[in-house]
C-alpha cells in the first residue's frame, strides 16, 4: 500500500511539474498587421484563441517574456503570399525574411537568435505567389528575457493562424 501511495505521489509530482513547464504558441493578429516595406516588428499576436495558448510565460507589448530560467525550443513559421485580386506588387524582386530576436532587460542588449528567408522574384504574370519560412532552435533563456519577431514586407503576410505563428517550450532546467 505504501508503494502504491508513493507511486501515485510520484505521478502527481511528475504531472504537476509537466503542467508547470512553460510553453507558448502565438498566432498572428490579422487585424493589426503593421505597414512597411522594410524590417518591422510584429507586436500583435493572439495567445488565447484558436490554436494560440500560453502557460507560465507572459505575452506583453508584443514580446514573449520568459518567467523561468531554462533551455527552450523556440520556433517561428511565417508565410508570405500575394494574390492579384489585391493589386500589383510595386516591385517583383522581394526579400522575404523573418528574424527571431532576444532582448535582455537586465543587461540591455538585443541579439538575433535565428533568421530565415530568401530573395524572391514574384513575376507579375502569375496570379498567386506563396513562400513559407520555418526556423527553430534550442536556446538558454533567463527569466525576464523577451522574444520578439521581425519580418520584412509585412503587407504580404498570410494572416491565417496556421500560417504565421511563433512559440516556445521549456525542455529542461539549467543545471
Amino acid at each position: 500500500e505504501k508503494a502504491m501511495v508513493d507511486g501515485s505521489w510520484l505521478d502527481l509530482a511528475k504531472r504537476s511539474k509537466l503542467e508547470a513547464q512553460p510553453f507558448a504558441h502565438l498566432t498572428i493578429n490579422a487585424t493589426d498587421i503593421p505597414s512597411g516595406s522594410h524590417k518591422v516588428s510584429l507586436s500583435s499576436w493572439y495567445h488565447d484563441r484558436g490554436w494560440a495558448k500560453i502557460s507560465n510565460m507572459t505575452f506583453s507589448n508584443g514580446k514573449l517574456i520568459v518567467n523561468q530560467d531554462g533551455f527552450y525550443y523556440l520556433y517561428a513559421n511565417i508565410c508570405f503570399r500575394h494574390h492579384e485580386t489585391s493589386g500589383d506588387l510595386a516591385t517583383e524582386y522581394l526579400q522575404l525574411m523573418v528574424y527571431v530576436t532576444k532582448t535582455s532587460i537586465k543587461i540591455p542588449s538585443s541579439h538575433t537568435l535565428m533568421k530565415g528567408g530568401s530573395t524572391k522574384y514574384w513575376s507579375g504574370n502569375s496570379e498567386f505567389h506563396f513562400y513559407s519560412i520555418n526556423v527553430g532552435g534550442f536556446f538558454k533563456l533567463r527569466s525576464g528575457e523577451e522574444i520578439s519577431i521581425e519580418v520584412s514586407n509585412p503587407s504580404l503576410l498570410d494572416p491565417d493562424q496556421d500560417a504565421t505563428y511563433f512559440g516556445a517550450f521549456k525542455v529542461r532546467d539549467i543545471d
Epitope: 500575394h82 516591385t91 503587407s155 504580404l156
Partner: antibody
C-alpha cells in the same frame, strides 16, 4: 492639397504619337504610383498602365503593350504617358490618377485611384 | 480576366430618393471593389474603396456594401449635385457605368 494637373488637348493624325504630362503637387511624388486611364466617347473607363514613381517600375495593359511608354521625372514631380501609332479609336480623354497606396508603408499597388487629373482630350483624325 | 457588370445602365429618380446601383464581378474579388463618380468636364472622384470604406470628403449619403462577387452603391437621399455617371472598379477592370438623372 493634392493636385494632378495635366497638359492641354492634342490633335494628331493616324500613325503619329502623343505625349501627355501629369504634374503632381501637395504630396511626396516618389511615394506613390501613377496610373493612366482613358475614356473613349460612349465607352467605359479603361485602365492603361501604371508607374511606380519611386523606382520607375511600370506595368501596362496587354492591349497597349508595345505602343505605350510611361516615364516620370521625380525632380519635376511629373509623370508622362506616350502613346504611339495612333488610330482613330484612340480618340479619348486621357486621365492620370494617383494610387492611394503609399509605397513607404507597403509594396502593393492597390488600384484605388484617390486623386485624378482633369483629363486631356486627344483627338486622332486625318 | 475579370469582367465587371453594372446594373442598371441608367436610372431616373427624384430628389430625396434612395438610389441603389449593383455591380457584379465575373469571379470572387473579396472586398477589392471601388466606386467612382464622373461628371462631364470634371476629374473623376473616388467615393468608396474596399467595398464599403468612405473616401474622406465624400458625403455620408453615399455607402457601399457587398463582398465576393456582388456589390452595391447606395445614395440614401439623392441630391441634384449627384447627377453623374457612376463606375465600379476592381483593379484593371471597370464596369460599364450607370448614368443617374433627376426626374
Amino acid at each position: 492639397q493634392v493636385q494632378l494637373v495635366q497638359s492641354g488637348a492634342e490633335v494628331r493624325k493616324p500613325g503619329a504619337s502623343v505625349k501627355v504630362s501629369c504634374k503632381a503637387s501637395g504630396y511626396d511624388f516618389s511615394n506613390y504610383a501613377i496610373h493612366w486611364v482613358r475614356q473613349a466617347p460612349g465607352q467605359r473607363l479603361e485602365w492603361m498602365g501604371w508607374i511606380n514613381a519611386g523606382n520607375g517600375n511600370t506595368k501596362f495593359s496587354q492591349k497597349f503593350q508595345g505602343r505605350i511608354t510611361v516615364t516620370r521625372d521625380t525632380a519635376a514631380s511629373t509623370a508622362y504617358m506616350e502613346l504611339r501609332s495612333l488610330r482613330s479609336e484612340d480618340t479619348a480623354v486621357y486621365y492620370c490618377a494617383r494610387d492611394r497606396s503609399n509605397m513607404v508603408r507597403g509594396i502593393i499597388i492597390a488600384y484605388y485611384f484617390d486623386y485624378w487629373g482633369q483629363g486631356t482630350l486627344v483627338t486622332v483624325s486625318s | 480576366e475579370i469582367v465587371m457588370t453594372q446594373s442598371p445602365s441608367s436610372l431616373s429618380a427624384s430628389v430625396g430618393d434612395r438610389v441603389t446601383i449593383t455591380c457584379r464581378a465575373s469571379q470572387s474579388i473579396s472586398r477589392y471593389l471601388n466606386w467612382y463618380q464622373l461628371k462631364p468636364g470634371k476629374a473623376p472622384r473616388l467615393l468608396i474603396y474596399g467595398a464599403s470604406s468612405l473616401q474622406s470628403g465624400v458625403p455620408s449619403r453615399f455607402s457601399g456594401s457587398g463582398s465576393g462577387a456582388e456589390f452595391t452603391l447606395t445614395i440614401s437621399s439623392l441630391q441634384p449635385e449627384d447627377i453623374a455617371t457612376y463606375y465600379c472598379q476592381h483593379t484593371r477592370a471597370f464596369g460599364q457605368g450607370t448614368k443617374v438623372e433627376i426626374k
